[in-house]
């Protein structure tokens, strides 16, 4: 058993049918010695008397808010949560496996640049009685500071018969140098509590591996005289690290017909312009990627040909 | 990447082309190592990230773009004790700091070159003959060093009398390649920045 926060305790259980569970001793936080009784949650049934209460915690029915009283007055509370270990592996019931970029990906994180600011998000089908708390650091043995905000509900989607809820959090490394070469990964730890179930999820990454630039901005077309060709031009996104000559991007320019089946023409360039043939009813899209370290491509920025 | 990309102008900063070749070569070598050594811990998540140049050179600090010198987090340990001659210093605008930067890059390349050559000698003794260093990568390191053209003492190739532990050598290769790729990215950024200025 360990303390999650004041008066909230997590009991770790080897979870299998007929498991013996864990013996837990609760102590009433009071100078009083006599006349103390214990109850669980809203029930008035007295579970025991005395300054300490010994319980065998086996299932969720044994978890909850234990309260010690004296003469009708509440003295203190202890909330017991359960953390299930199923055959040596901590349970992951609360969050959905996003399966991207690989199986068992519960937290996904992205950064728009090298400033040390990043966003993580996760999915769940649970709508109520759910709380999250997020901590982060650079490295784990001698951790350096990363400050995270509160996790917020950022999107709701309908997936088949289920509603899916997306939560996200923004974090900022306290002293980040955009040019630094990372040798210690960022660690992100999310504590999730649903009713009386506790779970924790972690992700470990280098900022360089989670970079996803914003799409190029000010995408414009300039027709070339006496030609079906157009000059496409764009700019680096505002959110990208500066100076751009150091933090350079490379670009992919795509001409896509109205039908998804039509052949796509693609050109790669390090410049912020390109000359392409603009077909009728086609659209031109441009996306960006770090020129020197191949992390994710940005989303497409698009303009119609006409 | 499937790259129909414009080639660099011939009149451009002489080291940029070499640094781009270097990054391409080390990235290819790392990819080859990860595929060949699939049963070894060779992914970024599995290895310890060690920098053999740590406390010996300070390329990131010495090559910091002017715009980032205002960022206190970037100025932890600015070293200023490097050799100051070199053929990449084509323009008269070149400052003392730029010379320090380029000499630091040269020292990095020299250290990695020695490590890779020592390692290759060990890998050639492996009866499994599982993996060797790409000669192209070693050649590209050499080309960039020549383009930088700094005079410094030759570092002797380490020789070891004891029987090599091939498992450890292959893991060390992965560690070295990951670190060198990261340094090659920094070198490329620096060359691009210097070329633009």
């Amino acid at each position: 058993i360990w303390e999650l926060k004041k008066d909230v305790y997590v009991v770790e259980l080897d979870w299998y049918p007929d498991a013996p569970g864990e013996m837990v001793v609760l102590t009433c936080d009071t100078p009083e010695e006599d006349g103390i009784t214990w109850t669980l949650d809203q029930s008035s049934e007295v579970l025991g008397s005395g300054k300490t209460l010994t319980i065998q915690v086996k299932e969720f029915g044994d978890a909850g808010q234990y309260t010690c009283h004296k003469g009708g007055e509440v003295l203190s509370h202890s909330l017991l949560l359960l953390h299930k270990k199923e055959d040596g592996i901590w349970s992951t019931d609360i969050l959905k496996d996003q399966k991207e970029p690989k199986n068992k990906t519960f937290l996904r994180c992205e950064a728009k640049n090298y400033s040390g600011r990043f966003t993580c998000w996760w999915l769940t089908t649970i709508s109520t009685d759910l709380t999250f708390s997020v901590k982060s650091s650079r490295g784990s043995s001698d951790p350096q500071g990363v400050t995270c905000g509160a996790a917020t509900l950022s999107a709701e989607r309908v997936r088949g018969d289920n509603k899916e809820y997306e939560y996200s959090v923004e974090c900022q490394e306290d002293s980040a140098c955009p040019a630094a070469e990372e040798s210690l990964p960022i660690e992100v730890m999310v504590d999730a509590v649903h009713k009386l179930k506790y779970e924790n999820y972690t992700s470990s990454f280098f900022i360089r591996d989670i970079i996803k630039p914003d799409p190029p901005k000010n995408l414009q077309l300039k027709p070339l005289k006496n030609s079906r060709q157009v000059e496409v031009s764009w700019e680096y996104p505002d959110t990208w690290s500066t100076p751009h000559s150091y933090f350079s991007l490379t670009f992919c320019v795509q001409v896509q017909g109205k039908s998804k089946r039509e052949k796509k023409d693609r050109v790669f360039t390090d410049k912020t312009s390109a000359t392409v043939i603009c077909r009728k009813n086609a659209s031109i899209s441009v996306r960006a990627q770090d020129r020197y370290y191949s992390s994710s491509w940005s989303e497409w920025a698009s303009v119609p040909c006409s | 990447r499937n790259l129909p990309v414009a080639t660099p102008d011939p009149g451009m900063f002489p080291c940029l082309h070499h640094s781009q070749n270097l990054l391409r070569a080390v990235s290819n070598m790392l990819q080859k190592a990860r595929q060949t050594l699939e049963f070894y811990p060779c992914t970024s998540e599995e290895i310890d990230h060690e920098d053999i140049t740590k406390d010996k050179t300070s390329t990131v600090e010495a090559c910091l773009p002017l715009e980032l010198t205002k960022n206190e987090s970037c100025l932890n340990s600015r070293e200023t004790s490097f050799i100051t001659n070199g053929s990449c210093l084509a323009s008269r605008k070149t400052s003392f700091m730029m010379a320090l930067c380029l000499s630091s890059i040269y020292e990095d390349l020299k250290m990695y070159q020695v490590e890779f050559k020592t390692m290759n000698a060990k890998l050639l003794m492996d009866p499994k003959r599982q993996i060797f260093l790409d000669q192209n990568m070693l050649a590209v390191i050499d080309e960039l060093m020549q383009a930088l053209n700094f005079n410094s003492e030759t570092v002797p190739q380490k020789s070891s009398l004891e029987e090599p532990d091939f498992y450890k050598t292959k893991i060390k290769l992965c560690i070295l390649l990951h670190a060198f790729r990261i340094r090659a990215v920094t070198i490329d950024r620096v060359m691009s920045y210097l070329n633009a200025s």
């Epitope: 299998y16 055959d87 040596g88 592996i89 | -």
Partner: antibody, heavy 115, light 112 residues
């Protein structure tokens, strides 16, 4: 006393369907994940499928994906395996078992796919 | 397709020590715990070892398990005639959990 009692096995022609049941008693069935495991005659153990305690997630071996469906009725304390498009290679003894560091197995039920 | 490899058979005379190996990889045994099962002819498998080296109550102490790196082993010290059975190791793969990964199985024969 944890008990898993299986039923529903038998002889079936290729391409036909069969449903296996596993009745649980002696524990809070709705709190635990459950597996199906099979063993072809003279062969080793092969995992078939898993279902979470609340039925929210199901996982299948590639060899049965799209043909077998694992389900549970927590109100009846019963686990099911619906098998469709049966093939000769599905012939095996099928076991249900609890998920956890200590597990309990059903007695097994024989499924023979033969024309 | 079995990812955990066991020898097809091992044998010993009563009182001898026999060991069964179970070889896997970094993503399965290297990252997860190992169980061992005994299966007597015509019966369901019985758990012998969990969490690499733990014995459930009721399992004789002549059975012991160990794990090192990407391999595990089961030892029977002082093998007895009633130990003649098939033995399976089981683990998980970190990418496909909760799918159970079983070993290929080992037939233990007690001679004489």
């Amino acid at each position: 006393q944890v008990q898993l009692v299986q039923s529903g096995g038998g002889v079936v022609q290729p391409g036909r369907s069969l449903r296996l049941s596993c009745a649980a008693s002696g524990f809070t069935f709705s709190s635990y994940g459950m597996h199906w495991v099979r063993q072809a005659p003279g062969k080793g153990l092969e995992w078939v499928a898993f279902i979470r305690y609340d039925g929210s997630n199901k996982y299948y071996a590639d060899s049965v994906k799209g043909r077998f469906t694992i389900s549970r009725d927590n109100s009846k304390n019963t686990l099911y395996l619906q098998m469709k498009s049966l093939r000769a290679e599905d012939t095996a003894v099928y076991y249900c078992k609890t998920h956890g560091s200590h597990d309990n197995w059903g007695q097994g039920t024989m499924v023979t796919v033969s024309s | 397709s079995y990812v955990l490899t066991q020898p097809p058979s091992v044998s010993g005379t009563p009182g001898q020590r026999v060991t069964i190996s179970c070889s896997g990889g970094r993503s399965n045994i290297g990252s997860n715990t190992v169980k061992w099962y005994q299966q007597l002819p015509g019966t369901a498998p019985k758990l012998l070892i969990y969490k690499n080296d733990q014995r459930p109550s009721g399992v004789p102490d002549r059975f012991s398990g160990s794990k090192s790196g990407t391999s595990a082993s089961l030892a029977i010290t002082g093998v007895q005639a009633e130990d003649e059975a098939d033995y399976y190791c089981q683990s998980y793969d970190r990418g496909t959990h909760p799918a159970l990964l079983f070993g290929t199985g080992t037939k233990v024969t007690v001679l004489g």
